[in-house]
């Protein structure tokens, strides 16, 4: 049994780090493998993560962690029974992938404006809370050629779009993702998308 692609880990900078790797052949990850991790810190214990399958040869493990601080460094050992397959380390603060924003809602009852709101995925005491910026993707299932990305570089998790910039009488979808500039993170996953019907019509005199 051998590792084809070494574990690569990302932290949500809150309580979970996710490690993914590929094996040399089909593997029952949860039955055959264990990922042991330990914070390099006085009197810390070794903790065990049971991986799940992620495709035929892929494995994924969700490591429970404490709140992340920049000094934290973990040793990682991947075992198949008594055989050590791989040994490495992981500094969560240097490999951050934010949580996806949630509760994306579209408000169409505001005159001439489509208002999108969503929730910051972090509590106010988390360092990422005030560092997130967002990208909102809007597209139309009725008009495959239409897809736009709106960058939200201010802190408030809202986006206003003039309804007149969207075609009337068709449905749109939106989704949002986040990243934290000062922590040099990757983008989060996209939030679940939400759908709305654009019924806005320009006033008669503007037609």
């Amino acid at each position: 049994m051998k590792v084809l692609q070494e574990p690569a880990c990302v932290s949500d900078y809150m309580s979970i780090s996710t490690c993914e790797w590929k094996m040399g052949g089909p593997t029952n990850c949860s039955a055959e493998l264990r990922l042991l991790y330990q914070l390099v810190f006085q009197s810390s214990e070794t903790h065990t993560c049971v991986p799940e399958n992620n495709g035929g040869v892929g494995c994924v493990c969700h490591l429970l962690m404490d709140d992340v601080v920049s000094m934290d460094n973990y040793t990682l050992d991947l075992w198949a029974g008594q055989q050590l397959l791989w040994k490495g380390s992981f500094k969560p603060s240097e490999h951050v992938k934010p949580r996806a924003p949630g509760n994306l809602t579209v408000h169409t009852n505001v005159s001439d404006t489509v208002l999108l709101t969503w929730s910051n995925p972090y509590p106010p005491d988390n360092y990422l809370y005030n560092d997130l910026t967002y990208a909102v993707n809007i597209w139309s299932e009725n008009d495959p050629a239409y897809s736009r990305i709106h960058n939200v570089t201010y802190l408030k998790p809202t986006l206003r779009i003039p309804a007149s910039t969207l075609k009337s009488g068709i449905s749109y979808r939106a989704r949002v993702r986040a990243w934290a500039q000062h922590y040099n993170t990757t983008w989060s996953e996209w939030s679940p998308s939400t759908k709305w019907y654009n019924s806005y019509r320009e006033p008669f005199e503007q037609r």
């Epitope: 914070l39 810190f41 006085q42 009197s43 810390s44 214990e45 070794t46 903790h47 429970l64 962690m65 404490d66 601080v69 920049s70 000094m71 934290d72």
Partner: antibody, heavy 125, light 112 residues
Amino acid sequence: EVQLVESGGGLEQPGGSLRLSCAGSGFTFRDFAMTWVRQAPGKGLEWVSSISGSGGNIYYADSVKGRFTISRDNSKNTLYLQMNSLRAEDTAVYYCAKDRVSITIRPRYYGLDVWGQGTTVTVSS
Amino acid sequence: DIVMTQSPLSLPVTPGEPASISCTASQSLLYSIGYNYVDWYLQKSGQSPQLLIYLGSKRASGVPDRFSGSGSGTDFTLKISRVEAEDVGFYYCMQALGSPYTFGQGTKLEIK
């Protein structure tokens, strides 16, 4: 009441051995790292050794490494210090102390917040 | 190893007056914001040491509020706002960032 009670001290000749015990009560013993600290007559405090809650991580002062062995029996709520190849400079009062919570991912530290009454070790010919 | 240097080593104080003890570490004891791994202990004559302050500034349970700890990184201070007769003894700072734990030399507080 949270309590630590040491025993096993005494007079021993250089090169001899002693085993100190520290019985814990009033707290979930296995959840906490434990530490031994000693104090030579008229001197300050000196850290000797520490052990994590599971016993999986052990630390020693250079002055005792290779001679002393720290261990614990969580089923008996007891910490031990096996002292071999004793030297005159090991003469001291030995204290056990309750250390950090080690079951959390990052051990939670609240200081060495409970100490035993101490047990005296005298190494002399 | 981290060296902990205390001063003064002797501190005569009049009851009711404030007292201050300094402790300097040879390297930073700051692990993360608010978490300086330095403690203060008092050892009274013939007794075991007792914890006063942990993580630089957190008062241990049952410790009178006249005791306070401050500082960050390498420089730490224990203050007693109004010394009482029962406060006499040896005061030790200790770093607990990692092994080996190291203590300061001790400060003997005595009543004038």
